[in-house]
Structures are given as C-alpha cells and as structure tokens.
Interface confidence: low
C-alpha cells in the first residue's frame, strides 16, 4: 500500500506564440482545480477504462479575476498535493491523465459550472520510494509544470511497496539476510515468505503466508486467469476427475458482472461490485464522467443535458464514436445537404453544391430566405424551396405583416368576453363562471366545480407544482 503524490507547480500560457485568453474575467471570476487519474501499465487504454489505480481531485484554487488588457499569467493554484492512495502493489509503470478544470463562480442554480481547460496525459516508469520526478506537459497553448512521486505507507517498503518493515528486535543490527529499511534505518526488512507456490508473476503478499493476486488473475496461488476460473466456486461436490469443485447452480455462475465487476451472492440474487467508472446491476453502464477524460483525439467533453447523464464527447472533424475513438470517412456522415457532392480533403471537407444551393454544406436554398424578410421581428425558416416566416407573438401571415387576433377563435366560454393582451389573451367571465377560459360554473354555495383530480393526484391532494 502507498500513496501517489502530485504537486502542481504552475499552469499558464506556454512559451510559443498565441498566448491563450485568460479563462476568467471581471464579469465571470473563476478558480482552478485539478484532477489526476492513474491507470496501471504503459499500454494504450480503452476509452472507457476507469482510473484503476485511483483518482484524486485537488482543492479549489484562489478566486481569480483577469485584469483587463493583461495577458493570461500563470494562474493561481490550489494549495497542497493531490494524493492518490493505492491499496495493492505499486505497478512501476503507469499512465496518468492530469486535467485542469475551471469553476465559474456565477450564480448557477444547482451549483457552479465546470469546464475542462486542459488535459495532459503520459506514460511513465516510476519506482516507489524514489525522489520527486519533474515534468512539463503542454496542452494547446497551455503549459503545466508538476512533480510526482510514489511513496509506500509503513510498514510497506520497496520499489513496489510489497516488502514489509518491522521494528528491530535487537538494537544493533538486523537478523541474518535482512537489510535495514531505508529510510527507516531503525527498522529491518521483515522476512516475507508468501504462500508456497504463489505465482511470482501474478501474485504478491503483504503478510507472510498469503498470496494476493494482481488484476486479471485468481485462484489460491494466482495461477488462474480470471476468465477460466470456473473451478474456483466453493459450491457443489468435488469432482474426482478435475480435482476442482463442480459448482452447483448459483447466481454468480458465469460471472454476470461486466467490465471487470466482481460478483457476490445475496440471499435472493447477486450483487456486482463495479470497478470505478461503471455502474448498473451488472456494471454494464459506463459511469465515466468528463473528469475521467474519456474523449480521445481532442474531443471536447461536456456533461450531458441532464445532470444524470455522464458525458458527451464532441468529436473534432475526422473522428466519431461515443469517445471520439474511431477515425471516420467524414463523407459517410453525408454532411452535404440538398444532394451536394462530398469531398474529404483530409484537412477539411468540401461540398460541391447542386445548382440552386449554396453554403459550406449546401444548406442554403437560393430560392428560400435569400433577399426575403419577415416583418415585425419574425425569422425566416428555410426549406422546401419556399420560405416560411416564424412570427413573433401577436403577428401572423406569410410575412408576419398581419396583426394576429388571439380572440378570433372565441376562446372564452359561457359568454365570457375576450381581450387581446401583449402576452396572449384575457377572458372576462360572465357572472357565475370562472377559470382562465370561463370554463367552470360557480355554484351558488360558493364552491367551485373544479375538474376531477388529474392523473397522479388524488382528490384532496395539494396541487403542488414540484
């Protein structure tokens, strides 16, 4: 066990030309925070892969307001380290994603607005217990300077935090074959003997006699890949031929948990413990958010329209997929409207338009809105070769030149009189009637005959607008 520590030194404009605009302004003050995501190994990770080694958010930095006319300086940073605890062995090789987030401090209902300013990623080799490693990474016009290290939590020591240290039993020196535990020179490396036969490649131990498995391996000696672990179920009678337990029918048979989730039985069914980034009954739903940096190839990540939707990647030209992971023939998306011919030039798309159409995507019908105006604040809507006006409230007709009469349809019931009003219409009800359209008779005893309770409200319910 141990902790990965990240110290951000500076975040500001890079050295090249074209300094970025300050992310904050007097009108919209903001502050920065950082997120680090760690994954084991050096291989390319799938877009959905969670931060399997862990993730951490920094505190918020000081509020920053741009000085008008001044270039974007190094921005004020949060205090302290970002710390990512790891429970098992430190893998030695890891991938990281460091994101710089902006928190706008306007008055948003439901909380402050967040947006991703910059995202850097890399793969590194790092031994636990070593000195701080310094790094500089650039993301567009921004530059991030930081240091990082991995340190073991006592009693673990070593480059993978898998050796244990114990206080010396004798004051002078350690026992035979045991070294002092730097930097804790008053402690000695503990004799650590894993369970006999524990796989040296796929197993490790933090206590003598145990055998703990690295991800993807299982079994008492960590010799069985997870996908072939059908003999490890404790249920059912032992099979004489295979020497393993033949599982009886059980809810976890075949591991119903997707995406690396682990299955445990419950009295009535099963429960999946999902890895970070997934959720759902069977870990089938990706719970990755923009904070996990899921958009590849320069895709822009935004939260979904609903706070419960995790993220949406807006892909740059040439890429598609929910994570912008697929390179596309952009013409297959048929971007040219109205029968235009698509040309993918690599650096850009061109549309060769048919006669009578124009625009980057042949979207303008030259017979539509060109040179036509809609009166009284109406807007022209193109399509079908004939222009149409969407008129402002109170106007109608082909060109919005006619004043609309909201009372023309006689909307007031029971002899109510209709008055046109800037916001629509108002009904003045005849005696004995009430309601927005005079639709309800007023009983002589003063009670009103309101309509039956709408579906979902029982009579007598307060009609809350919630």
């Amino acid at each position: 066990a141990g902790v990965f520590e990240l110290q951000i030194h500076s975040f500001g404009p890079g050295p090249g030309p074209g300094a970025p605009r300050s992310p904050c302004s007097a009108r919209l003050p903001c502050r920065l925070f950082f997120r680090v995501c760690l994954k084991p190994g050096l291989s390319e990770e799938a877009a959905e892969s969670p931060c399997a080694l862990g993730a951490a958010l920094s505190a918020r930095g000081p509020v920053y307001t741009e000085q008008p006319g001044a270039p974007a300086p190094d921005l004020p940073l949060p205090d302290g380290l970002l710390q990512v605890p790891f429970r098992d062995a430190w893998p030695g090789t890891f991938s990281f994603i460091i994101e710089t987030w902006r928190e706008e401090l306007g008055d948003q209902i439901g909380g402050p607005a967040w947006s991703l300013l910059a995202r850097v990623a890399g793969r590194r080799r790092l031994a636990a217990g070593g000195p701080w490693a310094r790094d500089i990474q650039r993301a567009g016009a921004w530059e991030l300077r930081f240091s990082y290290r991995a340190r073991c939590e006592p009693p673990a020591v070593g480059t993978a935090c898998t050796r244990l240290c114990r206080p010396r039993s004798a004051p002078s020196r350690c026992g035979p074959g045991l070294r002092p535990c730097a930097p804790l020179e008053d402690e000695c490396e503990a004799p650590l003997v894993c369970r006999a036969g524990c796989s040296p490649e796929h197993g490790f131990c933090e206590q003598p006699g145990e055998c703990r498995c690295l991800e993807g391996w299982t079994g008492p000696l960590c010799t069985v890949p997870v996908s072939t672990s059908s003999c490890l179920s404790p249920r059912g009678p032992s099979s004489a031929t295979t020497g393993c337990l033949v599982p009886g029918p059980g809810p976890c048979d075949g591991n119903p948990c997707a995406n690396g989730g682990s299955c445990s039985e419950t009295p009535r069914s099963f429960e999946c413990t999902c890895p970070r980034g997934f959720y759902g009954l069977r870990c089938e739903v990706s719970g990755v958010t923009c904070a996990d940096g899921p958009c590849f190839n320069g895709g822009l990540c935004v939260g979904g329209a609903d706070p419960d939707s995790a993220y949406i990647c807006h892909c740059p030209p040439g890429f598609q997929g929910s994570n912008c992971e697929k390179r596309v023939d952009r013409c297959s998306l048929q971007p040219c409207r109205n029968g235009g011919l698509c040309l993918d030039l690599g650096h850009a798309l061109r549309c060769r338009c048919r006669a009578g159409f124009a625009g980057p995507r042949c979207e303008h019908d030259l017979d539509d809105c060109a040179g036509r105006a809609c009166a009284n604040g109406g807007t022209c809507v193109e399509g079908g070769g004939a222009h149409r006006c969407s008129c402002a409230l109170g106007f109608g007709g082909r060109d919005c030149r006619e004043r609309a009469d909201p009372c023309a349809a006689r909307p007031c019931a029971h002899g109510g009189r209709c008055y046109a009003h800037f916001s629509g219409l108002v009904c003045a009800c005849a005696p004995g009637y009430m309601g927005a359209r005079c639709e309800f008779p007023v009983h002589p005893d003063g009670a009103s005959a309101l309509p039956a309770a709408p579906p979902g409200l029982r009579p007598g319910d307060p009609q809350r607008y919630l």
């Epitope: 958010l57 209902i109 909380g111 959720y279 609903d306 706070p307 419960d308």
Partner: antibody, heavy 124, light 106 residues
Framework: EVQLVESGGGLVQPKGSLKLSCAAS????????MNWVRQAPGKGLEWVAR??????????YYADSVKDRFTISRDDSQNMLYLQMNNLKTEDTAVYYC???????????????WGQGTLVTVSA | QIVLTQSPAIMSASPGEKVTITCSAS?????MHWFQQKPGTSPKLWIY???NLASGVPARFSGSGSGTSYSLTISRMEAEDAATYYC?????????FGGGTKLEIK
C-alpha cells in the same frame, strides 16, 4: 451496506421548531451529496433540501415551500446529516427521509439510497 | 418547474399480464427515474436514467421514453410487483416527482 437512520421526528405545534438527524454508515459520507425528501400521509414524494460536499463548498438548495424556514447541514466528521425546521406549518406534516445521491462527487441519481424515515406531525 | 403527471393513478393487473405506467412531463426532460414504494416502507430507486434497472430489480421491468413522455413496463405482472410507482426528473431545477401510480394485483 449503506445505512441511513433518521431521528428527531415528533409532534410539534405550528410555528414551532424541530431538528432532524440522519446517521450515515457503510459508505464514505464526505464524498456524497445528501438530500431530504418528505411524504405527507397518503400523498406523494416532495424533495425538500440538498447539500453538496466540501469541494462544492457545502452548497445548499431548498424547495420553494421550505425556503427561509428549513436549513440543511452536515457534519462529515460524525457522518451526520441534519435538517433544522423552524416556523413549522401544518402542511409540513410528513415522513421525512434522508436520501443519498447515487455516486460520489455529485454524480448519478439524487435519490438512490433512502433511510426508513421519521414522522413529523405539526398540529395544534 | 416541471410537473410530472402519471397515468393511471390506480390500476390493477392479473398475474402474467403486461403492465405499462406512463409519466408525462410538462416540459421536455432528458432522463427519468422511477421509484417503487410498498406500504409502510421507504421508496426504492427502481429504474434510473430512463432505462437502467437498479440493483436487485427483476429483468421483467423496463423503462423507456424521451422528451415529455416516459414509461415503466412490467412484461409479466407478479404479486410482488404490487406497489406505488413514482417517476422523478431532475433535468430542470427543482427535482420533481410524479403523483404516483398505485398498482394492485387482481
């Protein structure tokens, strides 16, 4: 296992005050936004208040019906959520539920895990 | 704020029968959540983000919909499904619940 146990309900007179508590266990309390939801006897559900986590400055939000009368707060060191209710009205009579958001760091369904509820009766 | 109207308010179904409960929103919402509540117990999250079943929910339940119209469907009604079901949105602040649909077993 996620556990939310409400307490502090009871009979109170109109314009009186009451403080509800919710003891949370089985999860890392300080990484989850929390809510109070109420249910009047025989009626539907109504969201009352919400409090976010420290990294969101413990921001609080209230239903219009309780604004300026109720105060939601939390004590992360004790894994406790509170609802201070002042100037109570008869229409505040309900079972009050302590409810945890689905996923840590302010993500997922707001009302994923519910306590058993505590009854508040406002009556003269 | 968005008003959610559930229909029907009360319904009964025979075992094995297909059941559909609808939830209509006064404005478009992006997702809908559903809760189940049995008498004397707390509500339980049943379906989240329109179509995802919460932990322990039988596969005979499903959710669908978009915009202003959402539904919860039980492919084959069972006695244990008798309960009140509420829809809930939080696409728009404040979060709101439907008035509930009481589902009884015939």
């Amino acid at each position: 296992e996620v556990q939310l146990v409400e307490s502090g309900g009871g009979l109170v007179q109109p314009k009186g005050s009451l403080k509800l508590s919710c003891a949370a266990s089985g999860f890392t309390f300080n990484t989850y936004a929390m809510n109070w939801v109420r249910q009047a006897p025989g009626k539907g559900l109504e969201w009352v208040a919400r409090i976010r986590i420290k990294s969101n400055n413990y921001a609080t939000y209230y239903a219009d019906s309780v604004k300026d009368r109720f105060t939601i707060s939390r004590d992360d060191s004790q894994n406790m959520l509170y609802l201070q209710m002042n100037n109570l009205k008869t229409e505040d009579t309900a079972v009050y539920y302590c409810v945890r958001q689905g996923y840590s760091y302010d993500w997922g369904p707001w009302f994923a895990y519910w306590g058993q509820g505590t009854l508040v009766t406002v009556s003269a | 704020q968005i008003v959610l109207t559930q229909s029907p308010a009360i319904m009964s179904a025979s075992p094995g029968e297909k059941v559909t409960i609808t939830c209509s929103a006064s404005s478009s919402v992006s997702y809908m959540h559903w809760f189940q509540q049995k008498p004397g117990t707390s509500p339980k999250l049943w379906i989240y983000s329109t179509s995802n079943l919460a932990s322990g929910v039988p596969a005979r339940f499903s959710g669908s919909g978009s915009g202003t119209s959402y539904s919860l469907t039980i492919s084959r009604m069972e006695a244990e499904d008798a309960a009140t079901y509420y829809c809930q949105q939080r696409s728009s602040y404040p979060p709101t619940f439907g008035g509930g649909t009481k589902l009884e077993i015939k």
